[in-house]
Interface confidence: low
């Protein structure tokens, strides 16, 4: 679904696109377009991604620009003002609304922009499956600071009757040391399961700088989900995994 109207209220039913009027051809002069994107469920969040073909008049974003607000209108939390030829990073809302405002002046136009919107579930750009007998799992950007508003799923699949050993070389997530802090890891956290996320036995929830230590999984599947909030990023984590054939599987060789 593509929408190039100058402004609209969009209730997300499936992923779709909104564009500056006329995209990818030159946008119109003297436009002021406002889009309100709404998730169908009040507990859902929204993710928008800008098409790399992004072209708005540069000049310090004084004349042509697109603004993103985390909320129902311009009173929402300001997430950025964008122009030029470099597409903005993805934006994930904190609640069920994103408000987008596009302004153009009376001269100098570019191709404009296209935004894909969808319900934010998992972070596809940072989620990964691992099927090799050993490997390295790193948080996005490691060892640089990880991005905000992530939900990354890492799943290691190995043959049944094998044991997965996961060892962390580095671990630094935003701590939660204020009461009830270390109990809940309310800000950034890494969840680990022996099996699929939310299904297999929960191994633990981790944040701060205390490494999770050596993790063993005997189900043939080890899952990690890395969540980050909208502020304060740290270095993240790097972990090595290896697969041990169990004595049971040796018996069947």
């Amino acid at each position: 679904f593509r929408n190039d109207k100058c402004g609209d209220t969009i209730k997300i039913e499936s992923p779709g696109y909104l564009t500056s009027p006329g995209y990818p051809h030159s946008y119109h002069p003297s436009e002021k377009c406002e889009w309100l994107i709404q998730a169908p469920d009040p507990y859902q969040r929204i993710m928008i991604n800008f098409n790399p073909h992004f072209d708005l008049e540069d000049r310090d974003c004084k004349y042509d620009y697109v603004e993103v607000f985390d909320g129902e209108n311009e009173n929402g939390h300001f997430r950025g003002k964008f122009c030029g030829k470099i597409a903005p990073p993805p934006v994930v809302s904190s609640g069920p609304f994103l408000f987008i405002k596009f302004v153009s002046d009376y001269e100098t136009h570019g191709a404009g922009f296209s935004i894909r919107y969808e319900i934010f579930k998992r972070g596809p750009e940072c989620s990964q499956n691992y099927t090799t007998p050993s490997g390295v799992i790193k948080s996005p950007g490691f060892p640089e600071k990880y991005p905000n508003s992530l939900e990354c799923t890492y799943i290691v699949f190995v043959p049944k009757m094998s044991e997965i050993i996961l060892e962390f070389e580095s671990f630094d997530l935003e701590p939660d040391s204020n009461p009830p802090g270390g109990m809940f890891c309310r800000y950034d956290r890494l969840e680990i399961w022996d099996g699929f996320p939310d299904v297999g036995p929960h191994i633990g929830r981790y944040c701060g700088q205390k490494t999770p230590g050596r993790i063993r999984s005997s189900s043939g599947i080890l899952s990690m989900v890395f969540y980050t909030d909208s502020a304060i990023a740290k270095e993240g984590f790097s972990a090595n995994y290896s697969v041990l054939q169990s004595s049971v599987s040796e018996d069947f060789k």
């Epitope: 040391s177 204020n178 009461p179 270390g182 809940f184 929830r205 701060g208």
Partner: antibody
Framework: EVQLLESGGGLVKPGGSLRLSCAAS????????MSWVRQAPGKGLEWVSS???????YYAESVKGRFTISRDESKNTLYLQMNSLKTEDTAVYYC?????????WGQGTLVTVSS | DIQMTQSPSSLSASVGDRVTITCRAS??????LNWYQQKPGKAPKLLIY???SLQSGVPSRFSGSGSGTDFTLTISSLQPEDFATYYC?????????FGGGTKVEIK
């Protein structure tokens, strides 16, 4: 299967001491914060104390300075050392695992403080 | 300290009824709100965490909603095994506090 088993309750005189234990099994004990919650006879639930997996400790104002929470990772056991007990400390004491909330509870152990 | 106020303190209902229990926090707690069920002589059991997430193994007739200061636990169709006392609890800050409880009795 997650299991929490409290012990150490009993009858004690005001001013006395008791040490409660909670033996944990069925999960990676070192990965979870743990808590004590109590319930006076016929009353509601009252949070007593918590210890994070990294060692932060938290106490209700009513027990601060008298109770000490601790954990022994090698024994998969949570403890509550209760000193200077008062009659108002009489309650069933539950240990609870802290996941997204108090997601698993023990069956409780009764502490009676009476002269 | 954050005070949690539950209402009603007790209610009578019949099997099949839709039951709603409310919980109000004395200040905003975002969605750090949990619901527990307790039967006489037993330990509490987690039903709902983070205001609206159903704990694994809990029947789907239980649901939670709300954010900020006002929260609701709903039992869509009351079953005989649901007669119990229900508590809300905030996990926003220490001291962690519980509501006074709502006893659901058979009419």
């Amino acid at each position: 299967e997650v299991q929490l088993l409290e012990s150490g309750g009993g009858l004690v005189k005001p001013g006395g001491s008791l040490r409660l234990s909670c033996a944990a099994s069925g999960f990676t004990f070192s990965s979870y914060a743990m808590s004590w919650v109590r319930q006076a006879p016929g009353k509601g639930l009252e949070w007593v104390s918590s210890i994070s997996r990294t060692g932060y400790t938290y106490y209700a104002e009513s027990v601060k300075g008298r109770f000490t929470i601790s954990r022994d990772e090698s024994k998969n056991t949570l403890y509550l050392q209760m000193n200077s007990l008062k009659t108002e400390d009489t309650a069933v004491y539950y240990c609870a695992r802290v996941g997204t909330a108090f997601d698993y509870w023990g069956q409780g152990t009764l502490v009676t403080v009476s002269s | 300290d954050i005070q949690m106020t539950q209402s009603p303190s007790s209610l009578s209902a019949s099997v099949g009824d839709r039951v709603t229990i409310t919980c109000r926090a004395s200040q905003s707690i975002s969605s750090y709100l949990n619901w527990y069920q307790q039967k006489p002589g037993k330990a509490p059991k987690l039903l709902i965490y983070a205001a609206s997430s159903l704990q694994s193994g809990v029947p789907s007739r239980f649901s939670g909603s709300g954010s900020g200061t006002d929260f609701t636990l709903t039992i869509s169709s009351l079953q005989p095994e649901d007669f119990a006392t229900y508590y809300c609890q905030q996990s926003y800050s220490t001291p962690l506090t519980f509501g006074g409880g709502t006893k659901v009795e058979i009419k």
